[in-house]
């Protein structure tokens, strides 16, 4: 699981980035107008996307394979990487341009300013990710996803700074899940929710995701969860893998991970 | 299956503010945004405005924006209306009003409604 | 504002008689749904998205229409459809009802 080259295995497109969103009509693909678009919107306390806020999206990993109305009457779509079925081969915001017929039917792109952002892919040798809203709680049914990216031979070292999810069991309500790979899929690490603060971990290679869920019911403190590049060192040096299982109801952990 | 129960009839003085309930059952109350609509007497229904309940974010009918105050508490799955400097022109029957978030909306479940009476 | 007229305001009608009522818009709609409120009582979703019936709702009821004329057909009236049906649009802030179509029985 490593990015080298500038190709990366797998692809994990973001739902929703940097306050930008798609949406269709309640009866599917293609069926709204401009000014339907720009209902859709509003209704839900935003407005259409301009084309630079769609960009800003797609430069953090905003991939959707459908023409949507943007503002002032554009109509495109966000392609991150090339694929056969959509783009045409290529990236970047695919551009039907200003539509002269604002009867046309297409998707929207809209654009929240207040909505409480979360995830996305990021290549900093440093972040700090937090739960939406923190240090307020954080809402009910979200999903986020923080892929993480680093420079080929590099590896990942990741602490807890705060750490409060509901509690229970088997964390099937609200948790977070790490992975050692740029999927949710592949390369499982742990489970996490409860109060207690996890150990730190640290990546096999130079790609890691945290996937963060809440249910419909409950919530509570949040988290902040730091990570930092770390450089290749000689194999002597290097952290131990091990396998741990924890069948306690703070943390449920499986899989293989780096251990500090 | 889907249940809007609303507070019971409420009487108010002209000038004093009411809070009126709607909790909801069956269904995922995030899930769906919740409207309001007034029925005067022998008269027909108005829209008044919308809480999606995720959010929170509100948008009321111009008409209502000063009157009414839409609220929502996740943990109980209950909305909220307060209605404020009440005239007699605010009694009616308030209904909350389930829809889905696709547009365009509907609603596609009713609360029984709240008779409020506003008399000195 | 879109402002929905519904005609006639008040209509009567003989069991197995035909019945259609209208709802024009000031503004073109997608779709159009119509509700029905029998007194004292909650409305009742009865058509959504102009032709599709809501559950529970007899076969005998039908919706058409586009843009900004709708209608809502009863083919065969029975006393039970005795009611007030409203017209009412969800594509443009503010939503708006139409004031109504008493249906009585002849």
């Known amino acids: 699981w490593g990015f080298k080259d500038g190709i990366f295995h797998n692809s994990i497109w973001l739902e929703r980035a940097a306050g930008v969103y798609h949406r269709e009509a309640r009866s599917g693909k293609y069926k709204l107008t401009y000014a339907e678009a720009k209902a859709v919107c509003e209704f839900e306390g935003g407005h259409l996307a301009t084309y630079k806020q769609l960009e800003a999206a797609r430069k953090i990993g905003f991939h959707v394979c459908a023409a949507g109305w943007m503002a002032k009457g554009r109509v495109g779509y966000p392609i991150v990487k090339p694929g056969p079925n959509c783009g045409f081969g290529k990236t970047g915001i695919i551009d039907y341009g200003i539509r002269l017929n604002r009867s046309e039917r297409w998707d929207a792109y809209c654009y929240n300013p207040h909505a409480k952002e979360c995830g996305g892919v990021f290549t900093d040798p440093k972040q700090i990710f937090k739960s939406p809203g923190f240090p307020n709680e954080y809402e009910d049914n979200q999903i986020c996803y923080w892929h993480i990216r680093l420079k080929y031979g590099q590896r990942i070292h990741l602490s807890f700074l705060d750490f409060d999810l509901e509690d229970d069991p088997g964390c099937l309500a609200d948790y977070v899940e790490i992975y050692d790979s740029y999927d949710d899929v592949h390369g499982f690490v742990g489970r996490y929710c409860g109060d207690e603060l996890p150990d730190d971990i640290i990546s096999t290679g130079n790609v890691m995701t945290l996937k963060f869920l809440s249910d419909a019911s409950v919530t509570a403190g949040g988290f902040q969860i730091k990570y930092v590049a770390m450089d290749p060192v000689s194999k002597s040096s290097q952290g131990k893998n091990t396998s741990t299982t924890s069948t306690g109801n703070k943390n449920f952990l499986a899989g293989r991970f780096s251990h500090l | 299956q889907v249940q809007l129960q609303q507070s019971g009839a409420e009487l108010a003085k002209p000038g004093a503010s009411v809070r009126l309930s709607c909790q909801a059952s069956?269904?995922?109350?995030?899930?769906?945004?919740m409207h309001w609509v007034k029925q005067r007497p022998r008269q027909g229904l108005e829209w008044i405005g919308y809480?999606?309940?995720?959010?929170?974010?509100?948008k009321c009918h111009q008409k209502f924006k000063d009157k009414a105050t839409l609220t929502a508490d996740k943990s109980s799955s209950t909305a909220y209306m307060q209605l404020s400097s009440l005239t007699y022109e605010d009694s009616a029957v308030y209904y909350c009003?389930?829809?889905?978030?696709?547009?365009?909306?509907?609603?596609?479940?009713w609360g029984q409604g709240t008779t409020l009476t506003v008399s000195s | 504002e879109n402002v929905l007229t519904q005609s006639p305001a008040i209509m009567s009608a003989s069991p197995g008689e035909r019945v259609t009522m209208t709802c024009s818009a000031t503004?073109?709609?997608?779709?159009m749904h119509w509700y029905q409120q029998k007194s004292s009582t909650s409305p009742k979703l009865w058509i959504y998205?102009?032709?599709k019936l809501a559950s529970g709702v007899p076969g005998r009821f039908s919706g058409s229409g586009s843009g900004n004329s709708y209608s809502l057909t009863i083919s065969s009236m029975e006393a039970e459809d005795v009611a007030t049906y409203y017209c009412?649009?969800?594509?443009?802030?503010?939503?708006?009802f139409g004031a109504g179509t008493k249906l009585e029985l002849k």
């Open positions: 009412f649009q969800g594509s443009w802030y503010p939503l708006t």
């Open positions: 009003a389930r829809s889905t978030s696709g547009y365009p909306y509907y609603f596609d479940s």
């Open positions: 503004s073109s709609v997608s779709f």
């Open positions: 809480i999606i309940p995720s959010s929170g974010y509100t």
């Open positions: 998205d102009t032709s």
């Open positions: 069956g269904y995922t109350f995030t899930s769906y945004w």
